[in-house]
């Protein structure tokens, strides 16, 4: 009752390997690393056959098939390139994930290289089977912002893509009779979050308490350059409106807020986030130059439709920007204390502008980003948000614009966005 001699499958082996096999002898068929036993179109690690009483084997010898990791998972905001010819996805094949540059960058500078493992999964040395993450690049406009050496007083037209983080925030409260509507600016922090000033998103119907406007009343425009032409802009409704819990309407302390967009916006040359500073109570150093952009929306009688479609003359059609120096804190405090009124420039604020006054202190819309170029990371960092001191005092001598000191709120911002700071490789200032 001897069974016929067995030939191991190509790329496989049989155990035990004997010269002769008799009734009730069993053999285990297995495959080399990177191959799987294939029997009746079913993949398995091993297959057992037995020598029967009549001298035949209980089954035919299966084949060994090379492991196939199949098409790799798609990476959001990323691309896949195959290292092997014919886009092979079998054992030891290599692929490389990359992010859609220059708008996204791979988290932790990962190589993005994945190899098809013997187990049939794409594996990376660091991340294992997890896919890499493409994070939005921040603070790197597709156009170079102008050199900050020469001082500019007054506004200049911004070229498209110069301030890709600039957002126009439109609040239209249709529950009021008549409809209440107003505007402000904001800065894109990620594909889903806008940073702005709390006072832009506060309902003025209540003065005794701070109540945010309803998210249904908020629309955000990104990639907007000329308000007469919104065709190239992305508009998004709000999923959440988050005011800083300590925002004080008496003195605008903690004047900072976030809007979470209903859907992440696609990034591109005209829509890119700005970088957050590192947590630093000092804020930007005195005399550093920063830029603020805005459409100069200060006329209270402008309607949303006029702003978004007709480009009324009461505001700049084209995004304007201005260059302003940071003012020493003591000087700014003194300038406000010397005037009648209980204005307080707190440690959560800093000032910018020129002693001699001028139009420059008016150009930034409320909530707009005061950005400073960080030489170390070669990126633009949002150090301030247009808070107060204008427009009602606009252009007066020794009346500086007051900005929310963003570096005091970095932890709060990350917390609201639901991202641990360590994940994001924060850009550092100075």
């Amino acid at each position: 009752n001897e069974c016929p001699e067995l030939q191991p499958p190509v790329h496989g082996k049989i155990e035990p390997s004997q010269a002769k096999y008799f009734f009730k002898d069993q053999v285990l068929v297995s495959c080399d690393t990177g191959y799987k036993v294939l029997k009746d179109n079913v993949e398995m690690d091993t297959f057992q056959i037995e020598c029967l009483k009549d001298g035949t084997w209980s089954n035919k010898i299966p084949t060994c098939k090379i492991v196939d990791c199949r098409a790799p998972g798609e990476l959001e905001h990323g691309l896949i390139t195959f290292s092997t010819r014919n886009n092979l996805t079998t054992y030891k094949s290599e692929i490389k994930y990359s992010c859609q540059e220059p708008y996204y960058k791979m988290l932790n500078n990962n190589t993005g290289i994945y190899t098809c493992s013997a187990q049939g999964v794409w594996m990376n040395k660091v991340l294992g089977r997890s896919l890499p993450t493409c994070l939005p690049e921040c603070g790197q406009p597709s156009r170079s912002l102008p050199s900050l050496v020469k001082r500019i007083i007054g506004g200049r037209n911004a070229e498209p893509g110069l301030f890709p983080w600039q957002a126009l925030i439109v609040v239209e409260d249709t529950s009021r009779v008549p409809n209440d509507k107003w505007f402000g600016s904001g800065a894109l922090l990620s594909a889903s979050w806008i940073l702005t000033a709390a006072h832009v998103l506060r309902s003025q119907r209540r003065d005794t308490t701070v109540i945010p406007v309803s998210k249904e009343h908020v629309t955000v425009y990104l990639g907007l350059h000329d308000v007469r032409d919104k065709s190239g802009a992305v508009n998004s409704s709000a999923a959440r409106v988050v005011l800083h819990p300590d925002f004080n309407i008496q003195n605008y302390n903690h004047d900072i807020a976030l809007v979470q967009l209903q859907e992440p916006v696609p990034l591109g040359p005209h829509v890119m986030p700005v970088c957050l500073p590192r947590l630093e109570p000092e804020g930007p150093a005195p005399h550093m130059l920063g830029l603020v952009a805005g459409w100069g929306i200060s006329n209270p009688n402008v309607t949303v439709d006029e702003i978004i479609s007709s480009g009324t003359r009461t505001l700049s059609d084209v995004l304007q920007y201005v260059k302003l120096p940071v003012v020493p804190h003591a000087e700014c405090k003194t300038s406000y204390e010397s005037r009648s009124g209980n204005y307080s420039v707190t440690e959560n604020m800093f000032c910018a502008g020129y002693y001699e006054g001028g139009k420059d202190t008016c150009l930034g819309d409320s909530g707009g980003a005061f950005v400073i170029f960080d030489d170390l990371s070669q990126r633009w960092v949002v150090q301030g948000l247009v808070s107060w001191g204008g427009p009602e005092e606009c252009g007066s001598k020794q009346v500086y614009g007051v900005y929310t000191k963003v570096s005091n709120y970095v932890d709060w911002v990350w917390e609201q966005m639901g991202l641990p700071q360590s994940v994001v490789e924060p850009q550092v200032e100075r």
């Epitope: 003065d207 005794t208 309407i249 008496q250 605008y252 209270p300 009124g341 209980n342 107060w388």
Partner: antibody
């Protein structure tokens, strides 16, 4: 420190127009709405409505829709109340008060007398 | 509109004695945000009004603690523990919960 200073008394004829100002100082002007309140001689207070100093949008109580208009000159930190086509029953003292609902600081009042 | 009814119309009090003014609204003043926007102000003779109390019981800065506000829903009270000469004038309650905001008719506090 916080002050609301209103324009002086007005003597007008029926059918004329009056515009009252309320200069605000000592606080961030666009942070608070501004209410307008009427007090007829020997009578109580009546809320006329308010203006959002950030958006510039006015809201009127029903009795004050039509001939009454709230406006702003933000750069001068000054809200205005204009009454068109004055009637004898508009004779009253008009107050501005800081806040859409808070009304925590009040102007000194502007007396408007309508008489032929 | 919400009707605000103040009682009494006039209150004659001896200096040093307590005083109490009632204010009733025709509907609850509890707002959807959980707060009750009921306020009190004083208009001294020949002067502009001055707010004393907001959100039912919170005292404005500079207001003596002999003034207290209380109540909820539709019934509110302003109490003065010991009346002083400077307290004379007309007291108004007003609500800022339901549009349009409405004032009570006023209570004149006079010194006996």
């Amino acid at each position: 420190q916080i002050q609301l200073v209103q324009s002086g008394p007005e003597l007008k004829k029926p059918g004329e127009t009056v515009k009252i100002s309320c200069k605000a100082s000592g606080y961030i002007f666009t942070s608070y709405g501004m209410s307008w309140v009427r007090q007829a001689p020997g009578k109580g207070l009546k809320w006329m409505g308010w203006i959002n100093t950030y958006s510039g949008v006015p809201t009127y109580a029903d009795d004050f829709k039509g001939r009454f208009a709230f406006s702003l000159e933000t750069s001068a930190r000054t809200p205005y109340l204009q009454i068109n086509n004055l009637k004898n029953e508009d004779t009253a003292t008009y107050f501005c008060a800081r806040g859409g609902e808070a009304m925590d600081y009040w102007g000194q009042g502007t007396s408007v007398t309508v008489s032929s | 509109d919400v009707l605000m009814t103040q009682t009494p119309l006039t209150l004659s009090v001896t200096i040093g004695q307590p005083a109490s003014i009632s204010c009733k609204s025709s509907q609850s003043l509890l707002d959807s945000d959980g707060k009750t926007y009921l306020n009190w102000l004083l208009q001294r003779p020949g002067q502009s009004p001055k707010r004393l109390i907001y959100l039912v019981s919170k005292l404005d800065s500079g207001v003596p603690d002999r003034f207290t506000g209380s109540g909820s829903g539709t019934d509110f009270t302003l109490k003065i523990s010991r009346v002083e000469a400077e307290d004379l004038g007309v007291y108004y309650c007003w609500q800022g919960t339901h549009f349009p905001w409405t004032f009570g008719g006023g209570t004149k506090l006079e010194i006996k």
